[in-house]
Amino acid sequence: FEIALPRESNITVLIKLGTPTLLAKPCYIVISKRHITMLSIKSGERIVFTFSCQSPENHFVIEIQKNIDCMSGPCPFGEVQLQPSTSLLPTLNRTFIWDVKAHKSIGLELQFSIPRLRQIGPGESCPDGVTHSISGRIDATVVRIGTFCSNGTVSRIKMQEGVKMALHLPWFHPRNVSGFSIANRSSIKRLCIIESVFEGEGSATLMSANYPEGFPEDELMTWQFVVPAHLRASVSFLNFNLSNCERKEERVEYYIPGSTTNPEVFKLEDKQPGNMAGNFNLSLQGCDQDAQSPGILRLQFQVLVQHPQNESNKIYVVDLSNERAMSLTIEPRPVKQSRKFVPGCFVCLESRTCSSNLTLTSGSKHKISFLCDDLTRLWMNVEKTISCTDHRYCQRKSYSLQVPSDILHLPVELHDFSWKLLVPKDRLSLVLVPAQKLQQHTHEKPCNTSFSYLVASAIPSQDLYFGSFCPGGSIKQIQVKQNISVTLRTFAPSFQQEASRQGLTVSFIPYFKEEGVFTVTPDTKSKVYLRTPNWDRGLPSLTSVSWNISVPRDQVACLTFFKERSGVVCQTGRAFMIIQEQRTRAEEIFSLDEDVLPKPSFHHHSFWVNISNCSPTSGKQLDLLFSVTLTPRTVDLT
């Protein structure tokens, strides 16, 4: 190999060991029989050398540095050449470095031809191995602007006082052009300006200077986004840290077209703007840091550009001003993403503050809109608390558990509407009365409606799930001893049409000791399946539940249990079941931990089934499933 550098070219070539393959025979640069691992060639020198190995690219790297001095004379602006030409260099991983020094008052602009650049974060690499590392200067301090790959949106980077651009090319890469040019500009009065151009839909991830280390103190950095007018841009902060400010405040400022409040100032922890039409600027402003404990300011953010959806121009009013203790969250439903570019799906408050999820609270009227290609990607979860603190005031008081129509009119599917029902301990209990009798969901007879009510204890220490209930069954009411949550969960978009079938009234009633009482009025047409609460996990220790089963005068009820034994093994106490005729009060008692379960029995009058648990040994839980079937009486036994 021969490398000859013209005089006055201000180019230095350095060949040095890279990161050697540890278990390889060392390789050397050989110059007139001398073996060396580092060779420096300066302007005006001509050197002939060879390598002592067959594959020097596995051992050595080459750095070609050109110093461009804009301090003492005119600057060589225009397209930057790769010098010496890559064809004259040994095939090693090569880094071309251009170090431009200029006066503080002079702006320098790097312009990148197509393909534009894409910034990468720490630990990331470029697919083709070609990387652009760009740094600036503040006095004597070097500031890393960022590392970039090809195929992105960054078209120009403006700096002042100097710029260092390093282009890394793998040994096998055929590239023979720098891909950028340098122009002079007036002073930009800040650390740098990065221009990012979107031709169509897409996203860009960008980072503050020195990321993931700290942004220089009291500096200003600007990103200019060029977005076609027919598209919308949204900004989301992926990661940020704030330093400890002594004076001034760290912030981001937006210049947004058409905004009457430019610049719009946001804290880094604020929700950032979305649904912006056309070009906009974002600036990051640092502060004067505390000398003792400066901390670090850093920011990594994403700009998502996409077509506005029809929904993005519609404003929906969610009036929660008359509600109390209620919150509504619109959020992405969990899905596996497969598409390469997934347009963002945002919900916007007042059309401007957009994010992937939004929580609205009671007491206010909210205006929301959507910036989303497919609203089925979102769903709604609502929580409302109805609590009684004074038992004298609440007794016999009723509340309707209805989804407010404002919520049903939103173009997003309701997933859960949860009512937390709270009562004073040992003073009051609750009764749930449905507008339409309920069916308990079981494997034998699953619910196939568009929604169900999930009823569970709301006492933190108690793991008690009464079950899932849907309209169209035989359960007339459910009484529960203490705090519960009732969740209306939807399963199909057709819930909108079936919303009229929802309707549940909760009343506060005098306290009773049983955990739950189900009032069942079976229909003659169908078999009613009932199961103990906490199915699969077992009825909690020492818990008692009852079913009040009505039998019409002209019918006979057949009570059937679906296994021979309960399977429960008691650690302490006894588990038992009482079946009691309501008219005669005659009762049968079964020891669930010892006896076999009763064979199918016939009841001509209304009766009770009461199941009380012991403290079972782990793994031997109490789970019972039974059915009630009505058949006409053939003989009048009265």
Epitope: L23, A24, T37, M38
Partner: antibody, heavy 116, light 106 residues
Amino acid sequence: EVQLKESGAELVRPGALVKLSCKASGFNIKDYYMYWVKQRPEQGLEWIGWIDPENGNTIYDPKLQGKARITADTSSNTAYLQLSSLTSEDTAVYYCAGRLYAMEYWGQGTTVTVSS
Amino acid sequence: DVVMTQTPALMSASPGEKVTMTCSASSSVSYMYWYQQKPRSSPKPWIYLTSNLASGVPARFSGSGSGTSYSLTISSMEAEDAATYYCQQWSSDPFTFGGGTKLEIK
């Protein structure tokens, strides 16, 4: 097991010639640089030179050019150091070693005493 | 030739004490290698490529440096660390050793 076994101690007359051997086992010398180091009594280490057994290329410390000659026989997996025109200055322990960037194997050393 | 200068030539340390020895090259070298030698034994490769410990070397040893200035550090001296340590450059032939630092235990 990787080993470099050097030939036994030598007592030689001034002006004579000696040839030390270093037989490798557990690795192929063609994949390594084989080099020799001299250590005079109570002194430090001095690099003598090396051979690339794959192609026979050698390098020597210029101070020992003409004094030392390194050869290798890949068929017997052995490296050799020949020292000529011996003087009392050549009395030392001679170590052979094989090296990669991150791996080195050393022999136990051969003591050469030059005495009349 | 690249001249390697090790300092100090002789030092002693108490058990548990932190020990640092240095190696200075007369011109810039890519990496530094270190060897440990005990009396009547062959030198043992100790640190390669400036900062990597050879197989079997205790983690209390570390190496650092660049250009012309390198060092070997023992975070907490132990009796078995008493030996002579040599640095060597493999960057430019002849591949010279330093004069050695003899480390004794107090």
